[in-house]
């Protein structure tokens, strides 16, 4: 069924394997647990979590965000548009997750686990979306220059960037989880 069109009393195009939904759900919850641990270290290490200067750092970032048009909210829900947005968003977050590596002292392994688990989640979701239109992958050259730019920031901005990435990723995953439970 093309996005935005009604399904007119037709059999659903494919029957899902019974385990795929559970794997996706557990994977997202596992990543969210990892993010919580990383946020704990970030918040303990600096006062970024209470800072009101987030807008300054946010100007440098183009973090994926759920919007009404993406079809992932209860109002205006569109499962196919939404699934494409979730996968596209996760692919766009990968460069930011790469940036997070080496940003943690006591939670270095946790940062790696979040990154690796996200890659696995993308694979699970791509299987679920196999009947949907091709999903655009971020340009590696653009990602490389973004990473360089982020790593060249001063310490305060780097700390703020870390905090904003974790917060945005958490919000994105929570919205994704709610939407995916309907699918």
């Amino acid at each position: 069924v093309p996005p935005g069109e009604d399904s007119k009393d037709v059999a659903a195009p494919h029957r899902q394997p019974l385990t795929s939904s559970e794997r996706i759900d557990k994977q997202i919850r596992y990543i969210l647990d990892g993010i919580s641990a990383l946020r704990k270290e970030t918040c303990n290490k600096s006062n970024m979590c209470e800072s009101s200067k987030e807008a300054l750092a946010e100007n440098n970032l183009n973090l994926p965000k759920m919007a009404e048009k993406d079809g992932c909210f209860q109002s205006g829900f569109n499962e196919e548009t939404c699934l494409v947005k979730i996968i596209t968003g996760l692919l766009e977050f990968e460069v930011y997750l790469e940036y997070l590596q080496n940003r943690f002292e006591s939670s270095e392994e946790q940062a790696r686990a979040v990154q690796m688990s996200t890659k696995v989640l993308i694979q699970f979701l791509q299987k679920k979306a196999k009947n949907l239109d091709a999903i655009t992958t971020p340009d590696p050259t653009t990602n490389a220059s973004l990473l360089t730019k982020l790593q060249a920031q001063n310490q305060w901005l780097q700390d703020m960037t870390t905090h904003l990435i974790l917060r945005s990723f958490k919000e994105f995953l929570q919205s994704s989880l709610r939407a995916l439970r309907q699918m």
């Epitope: 659903a12 195009p13 494919h14 559970e22 499962e79 309907q182 699918m183």
Partner: antibody, heavy 119, light 106 residues
Framework: EVQLVESGGGLVQPGGSLRLSCAAS????????MHWVRQAPGKGLEWVAK????????YYSDTVTDRFTFSLDTSKSTAYLQMNSLRAEDTAVYYC????????????WGQGTLVTVSS | DIQLTQSPSSLSASVGDRVTITCSAS?????MYWYQQKPGKAPKLLIY???NLASGVPSRFSGSGSGTDFTLTISSLQPEDFATYYC?????????FGQGTKVEIK
């Protein structure tokens, strides 16, 4: 008032077919996954099937896979369960249920429709 | 499929009693739900995700537990609570239900 109303139940011979309907009213149908759950006379509850809000994904219990088909007509806010190759053990009250947004809970249920498979 | 075993299968209690129903899963489950069903009626959601009270459900109902062992508690049984209670789990499809616990008047 938020409600689901099932219809289409009745007496059918083994091997026969039946199509159940579930009409939704009092809420916006489009964002919710829908389910069928059945209850044999004097027995407990058994989950049968789920369909995603736009009909792209369906899930079935092993007992009905390849015999039952779940579909939607979103323009009519109605879900359907096409039941083929019916067996005596399919005799039950069939409930349709709405899945709570953002959770796996089934929060709104219809009153049920009785399907009797007997010769 | 994950098996859910409820205990007891039935119980007799008086108005005002504290009632506890347990649900044991064959393996660890992701989410647990509790439903109330009265004769000839559809099931009604009481508790979702282990311990969240469904909309419009009185606070005398509560759910707890994790992993394989879960409990539904009615802190002070009311006349309208005499019914059959089912636990239900989701850990991927299929959803499965317990066999039910019938709460009768003593």
């Amino acid at each position: 008032e938020v409600q689901l109303v099932e219809s289409g139940g009745g007496l059918v011979q083994p091997g026969g077919s039946l199509r159940l309907s579930c009409a939704a009213s009092g809420f916006t149908f489009s964002p919710f996954a829908m389910h069928w759950v059945r209850q044999a006379p004097g027995k407990g509850l058994e989950w049968v099937a789920k369909i995603s809000p736009g009909g792209s994904w369906t899930y079935y219990s092993d007992t009905v896979t390849d015999r039952f088909t779940f579909s939607l007509d979103t323009s009519k806010s109605t879900a359907y369960l096409q039941m083929n190759s019916l067996r005596a053990e399919d005799t039950a009250v069939y409930y349709c249920a709405r899945q709570l947004w953002g959770y796996y809970a089934l929060d709104i249920w219809g009153q049920g429709t009785l399907v009797t498979v007997s010769s | 499929d994950i098996q859910l075993t409820q205990s007891p299968s039935s119980l007799s209690a008086s108005v005002g009693d504290r009632v506890t129903i347990t649900c044991s899963a064959s393996i660890s489950v992701s989410y647990m739900y509790w439903y109330q069903q009265k004769p000839g009626k559809a099931p009604k959601l009481l508790i979702y995700d282990m311990s969240n009270l469904a909309s419009g459900v009185p606070s005398r109902f509560s759910g707890s537990g994790s992993g394989t062992d879960f409990t539904l508690t009615i802190s002070s049984l009311q006349p309208e609570d005499f019914a059959t209670y089912y636990c239900m789990q989701w850990s991927g499809y299929p959803y499965t239900f317990g066999q039910g616990t019938k709460v009768e008047i003593k």
